[in-house]
Interface confidence: low
Amino acid sequence: DADMKGHFDPAKCRYALGMQDRTIPDSDISASSSWSDSTAARHSRLESSDGDGAWCPAGSVFPKEEEYLQVDLQRLHLVALVGTQGRHAGGLGKEFSRSYRLRYSRDGRRWMGWKDRWGQEVISGNEDPEGVVLKDLGPPMVARLVRFYPRADRVMSVCLRVELYGCLWRDGLLSYTAPVGQTMYLSEAVYLNDSTYDGHTVGGLQYGGLGQLADGVVGLDDFRKSQELRVWPGYDYVGWSNHSFSSGYVEMEFEFDRLRAFQAMQVHCNNMHTLGARLPGGVECRFRRGPAMAWEGEPMRHNLGGNLGDPRARAVSVPLGGRVARFLQCRFLFAGPWLLFSEISFISDVVNNSSPALGGTFPPAPWWPPGPPPTNFSSLELEPRGQQPVAKAEGSPTA
């Protein structure tokens, strides 16, 4: 089975999330400050002319970029696209923001700065007060809260109206922990790192975030090629060399939002064995209900068979037997020189009466600035609300 069951199409996860149509209530829109009540956060809805026509912060955003507009989506969403406008004011508004940054959070405590696939944080904004400028977020971000930080190159007034586009994140995956992806040296270097991981990287381990293994982009048969434009060889895959793991396996841990009964895990793997990539020989998963609890029961073990000689990339389905947990730890056994994964998703059901986890289970956030964002797939359920998704820009899958 080369397809990911339940795999969502990122191009369709582009529904307006409720600023303009007011399904996001005023109480879920806030700001660091407002110039006046008539430019309060609640007036920041795209295409709205309420109040004085936008949110305008009290302070200058130059030189310090500390003012922000915050939208609380209440549940985790994949945010694939944002739209911005300046101040309406009956057509008399002159204030807009030529650029801005985004920060986002899944738990309200740890905030991450959005970056594009090349590490650029600053997003081009508006050139006038009325035009709507849409920005495709590549990579998209999994967030409950999103903050817009308007920028200016001099002391000036800036005002903002916004919309967010995406879909609900139903899979419940909060983070995965994995060893840092490595570089394969062929005729050219193939960079198999998780380049959109938004957690922490410490001592060869990435934890507390999501990244390319949950971004909905399935890798190609030839791992040197990519679905994305203008990226480096190996971009779609995260890979590890057998030589670096004396244990003979790569271990990953997955944290979910609440207790779930897990039916299966789907891992999209490369099997270009002529270049050393092999499906895992087997997978072993352990389960626990809380971060400080013991692993429960026997691990689930699954040996992989099938046509291992077929060099095509494919999804491997690992049955998980309905085991109930909030944390999974899985070991992927090497069957060749390299393991290359492009996606990992889970088929699960929320256990009735289980409360969402409060924030992450990670320590006070370690150092370097959290990287860019993630995305996931059986995670996502489209929520049309009657409207059509915003069409993609031409060119790149994530513009």
């Epitope: 410490v202 001592g203 381990l205 934890y207 841990e253 400080a292 006070p364 956030a365 370690p366 600035p369």
Partner: antibody
Framework: QVQLVESGGRVVQPGRSLRLSCTAS????????MLWVRQAPGKGLEWIGT???????YYASWAKGRFTISRDNSKNTLYLQMNSLRAEDTAVYYC???????????????WGQGTLVTVSS | DIQMTQSPSSVSASVGDRVTITCRAS??????LAWYQQKPGKAPKLLIY???SLQSGVPSRFSGSGSGTDFTLTISSLQPEDFATYYC?????????FGGGTKVEIK
Amino acid sequence: QVQLVESGGRVVQPGRSLRLSCTASGFSLNRYYMLWVRQAPGKGLEWIGTISYGDTTYYASWAKGRFTISRDNSKNTLYLQMNSLRAEDTAVYYCARADTGDNGYLGLQLWGQGTLVTVSS
Amino acid sequence: DIQMTQSPSSVSASVGDRVTITCRASQSIGSVLAWYQQKPGKAPKLLIYGVFSLQSGVPSRFSGSGSGTDFTLTISSLQPEDFATYYCQYIPYGSSPFGGGTKVEIK
């Protein structure tokens, strides 16, 4: 109050083993990265190793194989197991807590008072 | 492993002097650098983290600067209680090396 207290240091013969303890109070050890650092008499600080919140351990190259860091969450205690001790392991051994915040690493803000290990025949 | 080299290893100065201590990393380490002060028989005390940020309660005469591989701790006007040994430390957690230390002595 929030503190770290090391114990277990004593005079030990070369080739023997010793386990040092670092008991935390006022916070949970397993929410932080914890380090062991030592200081030989008249010398500088020397990093031994680190244990992450998830029990991943990292060691200085010279410490690998002879030194093992672990912890008992139920006792809120960090351990340093030292094997095949040598005279050059004579030092004051400190445990320290790595603090972090929204913008990154905030340094080793909390240290124990240290415990002296003397390796001598 | 990254090595941290401090210089000078010792410095003699008088009260009121400006003292500068440098720390050089064997490769670029970004901003994950801290400075500590240690007095004889005592545990180290954190002065500065993240290259520039002053730990709460530390006098403003201490300041940190630098980027990449070269970092500096400056004491703008040395006070009697500042005579001690100072260490830099890099914390990536794959390894966490300290510099060799700089002893600030009374001239």
